[in-house]
C-alpha cells in the first residue's frame, strides 16, 4: 500500500493562473497511489461541483483534471485538488485570477530594436520587448531588395522572414546575427502579433569594414598612407 503522490509535479509548477475573461482554464493534479486514490475539488475551501456556474465544469477523473470554460470574474479564487486513499491524502492549491483588462495590440518597447553599428565579422544582438495581454507571437523580418527595388508594385516592402517564435508576454525576444558581413546591413523589423492584431518596430544595422590593424588612435592618418 502507498499513500497518494504526484506523478507529474513539474506540470503543477504554475500555481497562479491569470487568464482573460472568456478563456478556458484547466487545472490538473495527476497522482497515483495504492489503492488508486480519488480526487475531489474545493473552491475557497468549500466542496466544488460547479452547480452555480454558468456552463458548469468538467471533471475528468482519469485525467485528474478540472476544466472551466468561458471564465468570468466570479470564478476567481483558490482551487484545491484533494487526492486521497485509505493510506493518506495530499492537496495542492491553484490560484485563479480572471483579467478584465481590454486586450490590445501588442505594444513594443520604445527604442527596441535599436539602430546598431557593427564591424564585419562581429556578432550582433537585436532586441525586441513585447507587452501583450494575449499570448504574442513574434517575427523578425529583414527588408530586402529584389531587382533593384525595395518595394513591390503593391507599394509594400520586400521582406525576408528570419525567425518566427511564440513568446511569453513581457519576454525579451532576441535576434542573433553571427559573424556579420556587409550583406547583413539594412533594415530589420520586429513584428509582434496577437489575436487583436500586429505591431511593428524597425531598426537599421550598419556594418563597417574590418578595422585596419594599422589604424590606431595615435596615428589616425596611418590609414591613408601608401
Amino acid at each position: 500500500q502507498q499513500a497518494p503522490y504526484w506523478t507529474h509535479p513539474q506540470r503543477m509548477e504554475k500555481k497562479l493562473h491569470a487568464v482573460p475573461a472568456g478563456n478556458t482554464v484547466k487545472f490538473r493534479c495527476p497522482a497515483a497511489g495504492n489503492p488508486t486514490p480519488t480526487i475531489r475539488w474545493l473552491k475557497d475551501g468549500q466542496a466544488f461541483h460547479g452547480e452555480n456556474r454558468i456552463g458548469g465544469i468538467r471533471l475528468r477523473h482519469q485525467h485528474w483534471s478540472l476544466v472551466m470554460e468561458s471564465v468570468v470574474p466570479s470564478d476567481r479564487g483558490t482551487y484545491t485538488c484533494l487526492v486521497e486513499n485509505a493510506v493518506g491524502s495530499i492537496r495542492y492549491n491553484y490560484l485563479l485570477d480572471v483579467l478584465e483588462r481590454s486586450p490590445h495590440r501588442p505594444i513594443l518597447q520604445a527604442g527596441l530594436p535599436a539602430n546598431t553599428t557593427a564591424v564585419v565579422g562581429s556578432d550582433v544582438e537585436l532586441l525586441c520587448k513585447v507587452y501583450s495581454d494575449a499570448q504574442p507571437h513574434i517575427q523578425w523580418l529583414k527588408h530586402i531588395v529584389i531587382n533593384g527595388s525595395s518595394f513591390g508594385a503593391d507599394g509594400f516592402p520586400y521582406v525576408q522572414v528570419l525567425k518566427t517564435a511564440d513568446i511569453n508576454s513581457s519576454e525579451v525576444e532576441v535576434l542573433y546575427l553571427r559573424n556579420v558581413s556587409a550583406e547583413d546591413a539594412g533594415e530589420y523589423t520586429c513584428l509582434a502579433g496577437n489575436s487583436i492584431g500586429l505591431s511593428y518596430q524597425s531598426a537599421w544595422l550598419t556594418v563597417l569594414p574590418e578595422e585596419d590593424p594599422t589604424w590606431t588612435a595615435a596615428a589616425p592618418e596611418a590609414r591613408y598612407t601608401d
Epitope: 478556458t24 486586450p103 505594444i107 499570448q135 513584428l191 502579433g193 487583436i196 492584431g197 500586429l198 505591431s199
Partner: antibody
Framework: EVQLLESGGGVVQPGRSLRLSCAAS????????MHWVRQAPGKGLEWVAV????????YYADSVKGRFTISRDNSKNTLSLQMNSLRVEDTAIYYC?????????????????WGQGTMVTVSS | DIVMTQTPLSLSVTPGQPASISCKSS???????????VYWYVQKSGQPPQLLIY???NRFSGVPDRFSGSGSRTDFTLKISRVEAEDVGVYYC?????????FGGGTKVEIK
C-alpha cells in the same frame, strides 16, 4: 478565392441554444485569428468575439460573456459560435470575419474578409 | 471601451460632388508603432460590410482612388472626392486597436 460561409442560423426561443458555424476556404485558416460580428435588424455593427489562430486565446463582448463560446477546428477549417441562454436582443445577422494573421501581411492585418452572414432570430 | 462617434447620420449628395464623413474616438487610436488603427467600411443593401480604408489612410485593394482617409489620434475623416451612384450605402468607421472592437453608428449616403 478567399471565402467565409456561415451557417446554423434560425429561429429559436429565448433561453434556448444555437450553434453557428463558419467554413473557411482559400487561405491558411490555422494562421489567422477569427472574429464574430453581429448586426441587429436595421442597426449598426457590434463585435462579438475573437479567437486566436491556435484557439489558446478568446475574448468576448460583455453582452455575450458567459453565454457564448467561440471555438475553432483547424483540421476542418471551421469556426464556431455556441450561443446559450439566448435573449431577444441577440437577434441579428452574425458575420464571421478574418482577423490578424500569424505574421507579416502585405496589406491590412485582418478585418478584410467577411462572410455573407447567417440570421439568428430569438423570439417567443 | 472606446466609443466611436460618427457624423452626420445621413448625407444626400449630388453625383460628381464631394462627400465627407467624420468619426471621433473617445481615446487615441495612434499606436506605439506609429500607425493609427482606424478602418472604414461601406455596407451596401443586403451585403456584408466591405473594407475601404485601413490604418487611417491606406486604400484597400480594388478601392477607387476617389476614396481617401485622413485624421490623427481621435479625429478621422473619410472623403469621397466625386460621389457616384454606386457609392450609396451605409459607411462605418471602426477602431482596431483593442477589444472590444467598436464601430461608429454609421452614416447613410444617398444620391440626390
Amino acid at each position: 478565392e478567399v471565402q467565409l460561409l456561415e451557417s446554423g442560423g434560425g429561429v429559436v426561443q429565448p433561453g434556448r441554444s444555437l450553434r453557428l458555424s463558419c467554413a473557411a476556404s482559400g487561405f491558411t485558416f490555422s494562421s489567422y485569428a477569427m472574429h464574430w460580428v453581429r448586426q441587429a435588424p436595421g442597426k449598426g455593427l457590434e463585435w462579438v468575439a475573437v479567437i486566436s489562430y491556435d484557439g489558446s486565446n478568446k475574448y468576448y463582448a460583455d453582452s455575450v460573456k458567459g453565454r457564448f463560446t467561440i471555438s475553432r477546428d483547424n483540421s476542418k477549417n471551421t469556426l464556431s459560435l455556441q450561443m446559450n441562454s439566448l435573449r431577444v436582443e441577440d437577434t441579428a445577422i452574425y458575420y464571421c470575419v478574418r482577423g490578424a494573421g500569424r505574421g507579416y501581411t502585405r496589406g491590412p492585418d485582418g478585418f478584410d474578409i467577411w462572410g455573407q452572414g447567417t440570421m439568428v432570430t430569438v423570439s417567443s | 471601451d472606446i466609443v466611436m462617434t460618427q457624423t452626420p447620420l445621413s448625407l444626400s449628395v449630388t453625383p460628381g460632388q464631394p462627400a465627407s464623413i467624420s468619426c471621433k474616438s473617445s481615446r487615441s487610436l495612434l499606436h506605439s508603432d506609429g500607425k493609427t488603427y482606424v478602418y472604414w467600411y461601406v455596407q451596401k443593401s443586403g451585403q456584408p460590410p466591405q473594407l475601404l480604408i485601413y490604418e487611417l489612410s491606406n486604400r484597400f485593394s480594388g478601392v477607387p482612388d476617389r476614396f481617401s482617409g485622413s485624421g490623427s489620434r481621435t479625429d478621422f475623416t473619410l472623403k469621397i472626392s466625386r460621389v457616384e451612384a454606386e457609392d450609396v450605402g451605409v459607411y462605418y468607421c471602426m477602431q482596431y486597436i483593442e477589444a472590444p472592437l467598436t464601430f461608429g453608428g454609421g452614416t447613410k449616403v444617398e444620391i440626390k
